[in-house]
Amino acid sequence: MAFAPIPRITWEHREVHLVQFHEPDIYNYSALLLSEDKDTLYIGAREAVFAVNALNISEKQHEVYWKVSEDKKAKCAEKGKSKQTECLNYIRVLQPLSATSLYVCGTNAFQPACDHLNLTSFKFLGKNEDGKGRCPFDPAHSYTSVMVDGELYSGTSYNFLGSEPIISRNSSHSPLRTEYAIPWLNEPSFVFADVIRKSPDSPDGEDDRVYFFFTEVSVEYEFVFRVLIPRIARVCKGDQGGLRTLQKKWTSFLKARLICSRPDSGLVFNVLRDVFVLRSPGLKVPVFYALFTPQLNNVGLSAVCAYNLSTAEEVFSHGKYMQSTTVEQSHTKWVRYNGPVPKPRPGACIDSEARAANYTSSLNLPDKTLQFVKDHPLMDDSVTPIDNRPRLIKKDVNYTQIVVDRTQALDGTVYDVMFVSTDRGALHKAISLEHAVHIIEETQLFQDFEPVQTLLLSSKKGNRFVYAGSNSGVVQAPLAFCGKHGTCEDCVLARDPYCAWSPPTATCVALHQTESPSRGLIQEMSGDASVCPDKSKGSYRQHFFKHGGTAELKCSQKSNLARVFWKFQNGVLKAESPKYGLMGRKNLLIFNLSEGDSGVYQCLSEERVKNKTVFQVVAKHVLEVKVVPKPVVAPTLSVVQTEGSRIATKVLVASTQGSSPPTPAVQATSSGAITLPPKPAPTGTSCEPKIVINTVPQLHSEKTMYLKSSDNR
């Protein structure tokens, strides 16, 4: 599998409509919780929790602060921690407890604490529960949690130093935790946890399971350096621990290695960064998407692998176990266990078969079974990805978070759209297209290029958004910027399953937001722009320049995958010649203008889609070079480098074949100058030249003036 290409379009922060939320002096907006039925997004930050309107996160609804007392700060600082940063209260757990309350935990100056947040009054109840085992002591330590039927399942560290890892269930009825033993958890870095409900019609009376994802130090592979291994672990919701062996401990804790590698190159991705569980009506079994980087990542590699949950469950239900054996110098080696396995199967959830054998609860399990799972929590079999290869491998980027949306294109094809954030504050949107990856676009969510810490996807039909949290705030972005594609060609070439061209309105529309039936809409995920209706009209921009000056003719082609070239009087221009230059790889510079330079200039783009090359006329300019008569009174001018003098610009209508403006761009401003009649169209084509006028008759100005033709925006 080849590396993923660059994103086709790059949207700068200012180019697209992004809604932001941040409060002065509040940082680390790393906990996000969405209440779809209330259209409310809850944000956990450092020392604060906010409720904002999920449809417009700039609208704050409530806020509550949970600060650390000076006394606690001082005690924390005495232990060698920073009073300004570490000895504060970082909200790390933000989970729904009931319809009217949230369960919130914070690091609380290295004394983790939890409380209930009443959503009506938006005040804490002051329970001040001990957060040990539910929330890390250190804000820098890894953590994950999920609330299941009113009980919090967490993966974090259990002590001040962060040296005792724990996966626990906080429950008044039956609290459970992992054994503090290397075979169970070996310096894990927790990533994600979620519950997978068993289908009600499940024939074996199975239990719900809670899955944990983490990276840990390998026990089974021995090298000179510590080898990191990505893991999937699971526990059963109905687990009550053992009666004697594994008392108050999981009897169902099993873990396995997650494989994400490129078989042809030996490239192994062994550091897990994030996981997203994709549930969809069309999916019998959930699929989980996992985001990885290699352990030694000096080149900025990231990969996404997708897994069927049934593959993982098969490993836990029927796979072989690993066992530690002592070799010379009391050295421990882990090998496949081939001996007899006790019954009931160690680590299995209590199902109807177990109940039939009178094992109605884990408290009934025989000590042989419990002792076995205590000693053999690691599976020998690994969990392999769908198609045995990554969905995406990207070079020169460090991905941080992932969310995935399953959507249906106009032709009925289902696409899993991956939204992947980077450590530079950007969001990539990617899909698999016939065994290749297409990165539809990159959106710069955060101006300061800071890492995205949290990603959240709304699942409500209609208004769909991605929410991203970082150190400085939260950004809300739509799933697609369809309206930014100003022509049918742009819309089609975007190959965005959310977008289709609407000929009646001559706009690129978001599919899920169109109330009207999809008849007549144009979407071609192959990128075949020939389906677009012929354009009978296009527009020229006419410019008059003075002799000897320099002209810059604009061509705003947004596609990073397109190659731009210029034609003059139907001959291709060579930008390397002394006469011409390219500005920003797209705009044409014509030096030392003479009458011979008058004529029609066309900017064309060439983009390879599959095995076809799509040509587009992006911009057309008519240039007329005139000798400008000297003004009666020569104004005093400051000395500037001039780019030519434009006397007038007017739009002419001309018949063209298949002309089409652009696709989106890196830093170009949008303009609708190509199509007629001129109207607001946020496309990425801009045709007007940037002209510096240094001598203009009838202007009694004493300074240089910069004039631009209107953008028709």
Epitope: R177, Q240, L243, R244, T245, L246, Q247, K248, A357, N358, Y359, T360, S361, L363, N364, P366, D367, K368
Partner: antibody, heavy 122, light 108 residues
Framework: QVTLKESGPTLVKPTQTLTLACSFS??????????VTWIRQPPGKALEWLAL???????YYSTSLKTRLTISKDTSKNQVVLTMTNMDPVDTATYYC??????????????WGQGTLVTVSS | SSELTQAPSVSVSPGQTASITCSGD??????VYWYQQKPGQPPVLVIY???KRPSGIPERFSGSNSGNTATLTISATQALDEADYYC???????????FGTGTKVTVL
């Protein structure tokens, strides 16, 4: 109704082996999760746990007495037998057998026999 | 360590609350059981698995277990609550049950 009854000698000489039987009714030691355990209590002193046998024939012993104890079961007779070697006067105590309940509400010594006092003396 | 330590005695006036503690290393990792024993009788379970009450045991008996200490609380103590109380736990490191040293509760 669950009943347990301990039987065995009331007087044992030092260095001798003590054999105690626990006869029970109202439950079966073949039922998943069920176990029978032995506890003793020297006069005026605290309870001390001795040994356990469960339905799966797993056996556990007090670490301090492990070398001297043996527990076994005869499910057909509904009986559990404890033997303790090398008796000493400090082993003088009331010896109890008890049923360990199973399942969600289990884990505790649910039903006790009345106990049998064993005196070790020459 | 396989030791569970209890205060030898606790005195309480009728109607008052008696708290009996049981200390042991990382006790909250283990289930704690509480037994009441009256003279000449075998013990009777009053609390199992830290805080659960068997049927037939009055509501005034409650249990908790946190850190290194488990507590049996008898609220509105009555004269008939006068007895010896033992805590008990399973010590997984040595695979054995351990009883506490016992607390004599006297109702004044």
């Amino acid at each position: 109704q669950v009943t347990l009854k301990e039987s065995g000698p009331t007087l044992v000489k030092p260095t001798q082996t003590l054999t105690l039987a626990c006869s029970f009714s109202g439950f079966s030691l073949t039922t998943t999760g069920v176990a029978v355990t032995w506890i003793r209590q020297p006069p005026g002193k605290a309870l001390e746990w001795l040994a356990l046998i469960d339905w799966d024939d797993d056996k556990y012993y007090s670490t301090s007495l492990k070398t001297r104890l043996t527990i076994s079961k005869d499910t057909s007779k509904n009986q559990v037998v404890l033997t303790m070697t090398n008796m000493d006067p400090v082993d003088t105590a009331t010896y109890y057998c008890a049923r360990i309940a199973s399942g969600d509400s289990g884990g505790y010594f649910a039903d006790w026999g009345q106990g049998t006092l064993v005196t070790v003396s020459s | 360590s396989s030791e569970l330590t209890q205060a030898p005695s606790v005195s309480v006036s009728p109607g008052q609350t008696a708290s009996i503690t049981c200390s042991g290393d990382k006790l909250d990792d283990k289930y704690v059981y509480w037994y009441q024993q009256k003279p000449g009788q075998p013990p009777v379970l009053v609390i199992y698995r830290d805080n659960k009450r068997p049927s037939g045991i009055p509501e005034r008996f409650s249990g908790s277990n946190s850190g290194n200490t488990a507590t049996l609380t008898i609220s509105a103590t009555q004269a008939l609550d006068e007895a010896d109380y033992y805590c008990q736990a399973w010590e997984s490191s040595s695979d054995q049950y351990v009883f506490g040293t016992g607390t004599k509760v006297t109702v004044l």
